[in-house]
């Protein structure tokens, strides 16, 4: 499989058959698949060097792995997008052997003197062809030469099979399955041959191709493949429930932010709640996690403005649940990214020198910001797309707080909507879905560059649009939701999560 190890070295060779038998639309589809693959790999913070070859009678090398920009995913994607099917129109035979020899030439080194670290570089060949080679001879001989060059299958104790993966995608109206199978790697419990039909569900294909065992701790990563559970798609999501004898129970959500901590809303708990009465589950697992302590933001005080006629005051409505035992990350349990951390810098593919302010400008610019939250409906987790009103609609969004029960007497809305809040909901630019009571504490998320970054914690809403846990279809325009802006509680997060190796900026 493609081992996505951010600390490893990898060369990926994209080889695309542009011969007569492929056809223009299949060629375009194959290109799109490769563009998606480049993006998927880049989302892991991995920077492989790419080689890019198209071929028919002759190969054309568009990107050499030795080029400085070959590890720049955006640049490689640009080169790929600029390739036309017509480029091989005049010489349109199919010489797969010559194309693979072009790959071999990129892999090999001058004077047979291997460079430092050559034996730690993994090589992945992704060949898109119909397998109908009609000139140049059998391409399998080049695969054998490549195996020889990379010393694969020669040392009984160290066969190095994981240093070469050959994936073959059958494209075109007619595919010679025998030829395609012969070229692809054969490894136990792995799939290296894919058909055109598979390309309709690329996430499923990538799931078969990628080994992410070295990057399970990466924040904000998800799998969207069809066989995936709700928690493959939202692996950070935590369900919280507080059992209060004779008073029923309170349900909330939270987000895994590290191996020991779940971030949620402070109002989910009272000072009287004992740790043993708080149930937290992650990854869709039935068992509850043992809790060591709940840490409230020191400035949170729901009764802080009672004297001023404000019955409930949600400023600084954040809490961290510290778990007794370390979480074991996997595909259904992994952390969400937090603002102003090194992990988020990498997730957004920003330079290492990026400041907290620059992250803020990237994630929360002064405009309507597309975001999402995760809600549970009929036992299923679903993503709800909303817009954070952070530009010219911010004021009107915040003013709608006056329609909230108990806030109608508030003279100055900034008394309840402090600078700590982000506002969503309403009907402009689109009709936003609203949060329900059970969504409290869950993350407000910005999805960027295939990664998920938490920017807020769901706190309170103006209108209860979820009678009997069913979302009402028709809701008033003033149905707004307020979320604690994580950029505003960073000192507290940094202090409490200082031992979690998140690399706060």
């Amino acid at each position: 499989k493609i081992v996505l190890d951010p600390s490893g070295s990898m060369n990926i060779y994209l080889v695309l058959d542009g011969s007569d038998s492929i056809g223009a639309s299949n060629f375009t589809g194959a290109k799109k698949c490769l563009v998606n693959l480049i993006e998927k790999v880049a989302s892991y913070g991995v920077k492989p060097r790419y080689g890019l070859v198209t071929y028919a009678t002759y190969p054309k090398i568009w990107v050499k792995v030795s080029e400085a920009d070959s590890s720049n995913a955006d640049w490689v994607t640009k080169q790929l997008n600029e390739i036309n099917y017509e480029d091989h129109k005049l010489k349109s035979g199919t010489n797969t052997k010559k194309a693979l020899q072009a790959v071999y030439s990129m892999m090999s080194w001058p004077d047979d003197v291997p460079p430092e670290g050559w034996n730690r570089t993994r090589h992945v060949i992704i060949l898109m062809t119909d397998g109908l080679h009609n000139m140049g001879g059998d391409p399998i001989t080049v695969i054998d030469e490549i195996r020889d060059l990379l010393y694969i299958g020669k040392d009984r104790k160290n066969p190095r099979e994981d240093y070469l993966d050959v994936y073959v995608f059958g494209v075109g109206p007619l595919v010679n399955q025998v030829n395609i199978n012969a070229l692809a790697s054969k490894k136990d419990n792995e799939q290296h041959v894919f058909k055109v039909k598979d390309m309709e569900n690329l996430e499923d294909v990538f799931y078969q191709m990628i080994d992410e065992s070295q990057s399970l701790s990466l924040c904000g990563m998800v799998w969207e493949h069809r066989k995936g559970t709700d928690y493959h798609k939202q692996p950070w999501q935590a369900k919280i429930s507080v059992i209060r004898p004779s008073k029923g129970h309170e349900s909330c959500m939270g987000a895994v932010v590290s191996e020991y901590f779940v971030l949620t809303a402070a109002h989910c708990f009272t000072v009287d709640d004992k740790e043993h009465s708080i149930k937290v589950s992650v990854g869709g697992e039935k068992r509850d996690l043992e809790i060591e302590v709940v840490l409230f933001h020191p400035n949170y005080n729901i009764n802080g403005k009672k004297e001023a006629g404000i019955p409930e005051f949600y400023d600084y409505d954040v809490a961290l649940i510290k778990l007794k035992n370390k979480l074991k990350y996997g595909q259904t349990i992994r952390p969400i990214c937090l603002p102003c951390t090194e992990g988020t810098t990498r997730a957004l593919r920003l330079p290492p020198t990026t400041t907290c302010q620059q992250q803020k400008e990237e994630l929360l610019p002064a405009q309507d910001i597309k975001a999402l939250f995760v809600s549970e409906e009929e036992k299923k987790l679903t993503r709800k797309e909303v817009y954070i009103k952070n530009g010219d609609k911010k004021g009107s969004c915040e003013r709608d707080a006056q329609y909230a029960p108990g806030y109608d007497k508030v003279k100055d809305i900034s008394e309840v909507v402090t600078p700590r809040f982000l506002c969503t909901g309403g009907v402009s630019p689109y009709a936003d879905p609203n949060t329900c009571r059970g969504d409290s504490g869950g993350p407000l998320i910005v999805h960027k560059r295939s990664r998920f970054i938490q920017v807020g914690v769901i706190s309170w809403g103006v209108v209860d649009v979820c009678k009997n846990q069913k979302r009402q279809k028709q809701v008033p325009a003033h149905a707004r939701d307020f979320h604690i802006n994580l950029f505003q509680v960073l000192p507290w997060l940094k202090e409490k999560l200082q031992d979690e190796d998140l690399g706060f900026l």
Partner: antibody, heavy 121, light 111 residues
């Protein structure tokens, strides 16, 4: 056809030095471990060390009895293996063999004819 | 290091007889499902010759009367029906752990 030919043996005084060579042909030299083995007169075989193949950067490994005194090296451009022997002792008297160590099964599948080293005053 | 002990030290048998040579290792020479034990034959004045690799695999060009068996610490070289030219010294050698080591040898005499 695989061939290994040792040279450089002879008479040397205790404390002296000698460099043995093993010229090879008929196979891709850099892809193999290469070992040195010796046999004292009337005694059994003693493995001295090897030079690993290219994946391991040709790094050497030595038997405890010669570590620090003997050095194994190779010149891949000449397909030749070397054994540099310093601070020689009378007990180093032996026939010295070089052998190709096949990493496909970690056995010495081809041997040279051997070269005699006599350490005596 | 792994010490290999061969027995018997010498063996005297007639042509056509079966020879069984033993080699015991001070610790296991198995790794990842393979036994890294090899057997060599050496005739006087000649270089050793590989007979068996990885405990039981016959090297190409070696007569089928030679066979190897065993795993872990106990290994056997068997010559099913002795020929006069089989008179030689036989060495076992482990290549599982560095440093490699040889047994002290078993001298096989053909009567």
């Amino acid at each position: 056809e695989v061939q290994l030919v040792e040279s450089g043996g002879g008479l040397v005084q205790p404390g002296g030095s000698l460099r043995l060579s093993c010229a090879t042909s008929g196979f891709t030299f850099r892809d193999y471990y290469m070992s040195w083995v010796r046999q004292a007169p009337g005694k059994g075989l003693e493995w001295l060390g090897f030079s690993r193949h290219r994946v391991y950067g040709y790094t050497p490994e030595y038997a405890a009895s010669v570590k620090g005194r003997f050095t194994i090296s190779r010149d891949n451009s000449k397909n030749t293996l070397y054994l540099q022997m310093n601070s020689l002792k009378t007990e180093d008297t032996a026939v010295y063999y070089c052998a190709r160590d096949n990493p496909g099964y970690y056995a010495m599948d081809y041997w040279g004819q051997g070269t005699l080293v006599t350490v005596s005053s | 290091e792994i010490v290999l002990t061969q027995s018997p030290a010498t063996l005297s048998l007639s042509p056509g007889e079966r020879a069984t040579l033993s080699c015991k290792a001070s610790q296991s020479v198995d790794y990842d499902g393979d036994s890294y034990m090899n057997w060599y034959q050496q005739k006087p004045g000649q270089a050793p010759r590989l007979l068996i690799y990885a405990a039981s695999n016959l090297e190409s060009g070696i007569p089928a009367r030679f066979s190897g068996s065993g795993s872990g610490t106990d290994f056997t070289l068997t010559i099913s029906s002795l020929e006069p030219e089989d008179g030689a010294t036989y060495y076992c050698q482990q290549s599982n752990a560095d440093p490699y080591t040889f047994g002290q040898g078993t001298k096989l005499e053909i009567k």
